[in-house]
Interface confidence: low
């Protein structure tokens, strides 16, 4: 036949086919031409668009051993795991001297169970606390009806009241799973179970019932655990810092911890072997055998100042006729709070004590009465805080002074 | 039109079994979810049994777990109850019903009903 | 288990009236509610799901209401072929359960 008549028929002897099938398939379009002289490559359309990165391959076979002779070109697409992306009518083009040509359309369609976007996740929740689930799932073929399954019990959600997507679930008192199930006219995909466990509520109205300077004895109001008591509730206690830190809403105390562990009930506990006179943090949580609850905000709280807990050291007295001149050191104990000031007491045999607050100074004169004849003079000498004195010191005889 | 008929009710002892039958007609059967619903003498209506489109899910009533079985055979557009270990409470009118599309545990189109008379 | 209950075993109504049937669960249903007409020596028809929507065919003098625990279905100008027993059903959960039933009589 005469090249310009055979130019003008399709060179198409094999048309793409249909593929309709589920989610995941594995499939072959195929064409095949048949020209005279050099082979033209193949493209692939996707709904009248050229696809640039489709995973085809070429065969050309010649039919006769003259380059001019007729080649048979068969080039497949390979689909190799059909998505709702690859549906739609699918052809060949060639161009061939000045004209293009374009295969018989072959369809691809997705038609399976549905396939799920998005499925229902495990978490945790505190018990009685609202929560919302989402389950999403797609066809084709199109609707997709979502049922809701609690404990393997289905639920119901009324169309129009709330999407079926997200289930509201109002509270739980105890540990249940959920699942999603996704029906079509192919039938129904179950999605995976999400276990969602109930935790006990934080624990509210964390307060102090009393203050020591090193005990704390702090109360809290359980929150509902559900069908699940209360096996115990962990309390945390750290130094506060700079200001920084906790503060400021970090979740983490700066340095690890004081933990303690209380038996319920009583939801209180003593805290000792605290710092006197010390800023600290508390919070509080609560377990039952499904878990512990979150933390509460942490809470400000401080020791109060306790009395210094050893006397002034060092104390030296010496007397001078009518004077006597006494000082003396810092305690080596701790003080538990703010030191104030000194208090001393002086005492003759057969006098009166005579008691003097100095303040914060380490040394006093005193005058004596009279001629400084009063015999066997001793004096004692206390630290205190706000929290009041501290322990006295032995008493120390009052020495003659010798010059030089 | 959507049409249901029941068979295979009758009068058993205690203990016997009986297998109703539900052929439908006038719709898609495997689209849809069925049921099984007995009236006792008293006009009260109890839920027995339900059955998904595909056949893969069953639930029941408790106190028929275990002695009932509900199947569909969806190639015979047909429902089935198995009734075994009958017991004179089971004496009932049994209804078969065609779950609605929007909620195959409502169910809008019921059977004449068939009669299981249980008793010694 | 999820109990319905009707607490009218008998409504007595006149042609023309306008009645309410009420039906209380013991827990809330979101809605899942049925409500069936059954007369004497027929099956029970569908009348409502999904607590207001009407079934198929179905005269829209017959609505059903209610949310959470508590329900209607109310037949406005009752006509005679209206008088049988009415059934509400909660369709929320297995097991499917029932109400004892309401039987609307003439006055």
């Known amino acids: 036949a005469p090249r310009g008549t055979q130019a003008e028929e399709s060179p198409f002897v094999g048309n793409p086919g249909n593929i309709t099938g589920a989610r995941g398939l594995t499939g072959t379009l195929r064409c095949q031409l048949q020209v005279q002289g050099e082979p033209p490559e193949v493209h692939w359309l996707r709904d009248g668009q050229i696809l640039e990165l489709a995973d085809s391959t070429q065969t050309q076979v010649p039919l006769g051993e003259d380059e001019q002779d007729d080649w048979i070109v068969v080039s497949q697409l390979r689909i190799t795991s059909l998505q709702l992306s690859d549906t739609g009518q699918y052809q060949c083009l060639v161009f061939l001297g000045h004209q293009t040509f374009v295969s018989q359309p072959g369809y691809v369609g997705l038609e399976g169970l549905p396939y799920f976007l998005e499925e229902p996740e495990d978490r945790t929740v505190a018990a009685n606390t609202p929560f919302n689930l989402s389950c999403q799932a797609q066809g084709p073929p199109e609707p997709v009806d979502l049922l809701w399954l609690q404990d393997a019990v289905p639920l119901a959600t009324a169309p129009g009241h709330g999407p079926q997507r997200s289930l509201h679930v109002p509270g739980l008192n105890k540990t249940s799973s959920f699942s999603c199930e996704a029906h079509n006219a192919k039938g129904v995909t179950t999605s995976r179970t999400a276990t969602i466990t109930v935790l006990p509520q934080q624990p509210r109205n964390l307060h102090l019932v009393s203050r020591q300077p090193t005990e704390l004895e702090v109360a809290w109001t359980p929150g509902l655990s559900g069908i699940y008591p209360l096996t115990h509730c962990t309390l945390q206690a750290v130094l506060s810092d700079d200001g920084m830190g906790i503060q400021a809403g970090e979740p983490d105390p700066p340095e690890e911890p004081l933990t303690s562990q209380a038996s319920v009930p009583p939801h209180q506990l003593r805290l000792g072997s605290l710092h006197p006179h010390t800023p600290y943090h508390i919070r509080v949580a609560c377990t039952s055998s499904q878990g512990p609850s979150s933390w509460t905000h942490w809470l400000p709280v401080e020791t109060p100042e306790g009395v210094p807990l050893g006397p002034p050291e060092n104390i030296s007295a010496t007397r001078n006729g009518s004077q006597a001149f006494v000082h003396w050191q810092e305690p080596r104990a701790p003080l538990q709070g703010t030191l104030l000031g000194y208090r001393l007491a002086y005492q003759g045999q057969d006098t009166p004590e005579v008691l003097m607050d100095i303040g914060l100074r380490q040394e006093v004169t005193l005058e004596l009465q009279g001629d400084g004849s009063v015999s066997n003079l001793t004096v004692c000498v206390a630290a205190y805080t706000a929290a009041g004195d501290g322990p006295w010191s032995l008493p120390v005889p009052l020495e003659a002074w010798r010059p030089g | 039109e959507v049409n249901l008929v029941e068979s295979g009710g009758g009068v058993v002892k205690p203990g016997a079994s009986l297998k109703l039958s539900c052929e439908a007609s006038?719709?898609?059967?495997?689209?849809?979810?069925m049921s099984w619903v007995r009236q006792t003498s008293d006009k009260r209506l109890e839920w027995v049994a339900s059955?998904?489109?595909?056949?893969?899910?069953?639930y029941y009533l408790d106190n028929v777990k275990g002695r009932f079985i509900i199947s569909r055979e969806n190639a015979k557009n047909t429902l089935y109850l198995q009734m075994s270990s009958l017991k004179s409470e089971d004496t009932a009118l049994f209804y078969c019903?065609?779950?609605?599309?929007?909620?195959?545990?409502?169910?809008?189109?019921w059977g004449q009903g068939s009669s299981v008379t249980v008793s010694s | 288990v999820i109990v319905m209950t009707q607490s009218h075993k008998f409504m007595s109504t006149s042609v023309g009236d306008r009645v309410s049937i009420t039906c209380k669960a013991s827990?809330?249903?979101?809605?899942?509610v049925a409500w069936y007409q059954q007369k004497p020596g027929q099956s029970p028809k569908l009348l409502i799901y999904?607590?207001?929507t009407r079934h198929t065919g179905v005269p829209d003098r017959f609505t059903g209401s209610g949310s959470g625990t508590d329900y209607s279905l109310t037949i406005s100008n009752v006509q005679t072929e209206d008088l049988a027993f009415y059934y509400c059903?909660?369709?929320?959960?297995?097991?499917?359960?029932f109400g004892a039933g309401t039987k609307l009589e003439l006055k």
């Open positions: 019903a065609r779950g609605a599309r929007a909620s195959y545990f409502a169910m809008d189109y």
């Open positions: 006038g719709f898609t059967f495997s689209n849809y979810g």
């Open positions: 059955i998904s489109g595909g056949g893969g899910r069953t």
């Open positions: 827990q809330d249903v979101t809605t899942a």
């Open positions: 999904w607590a207001s």
């Open positions: 059903q909660q369709h929320f959960t297995t097991p499917l359960t």
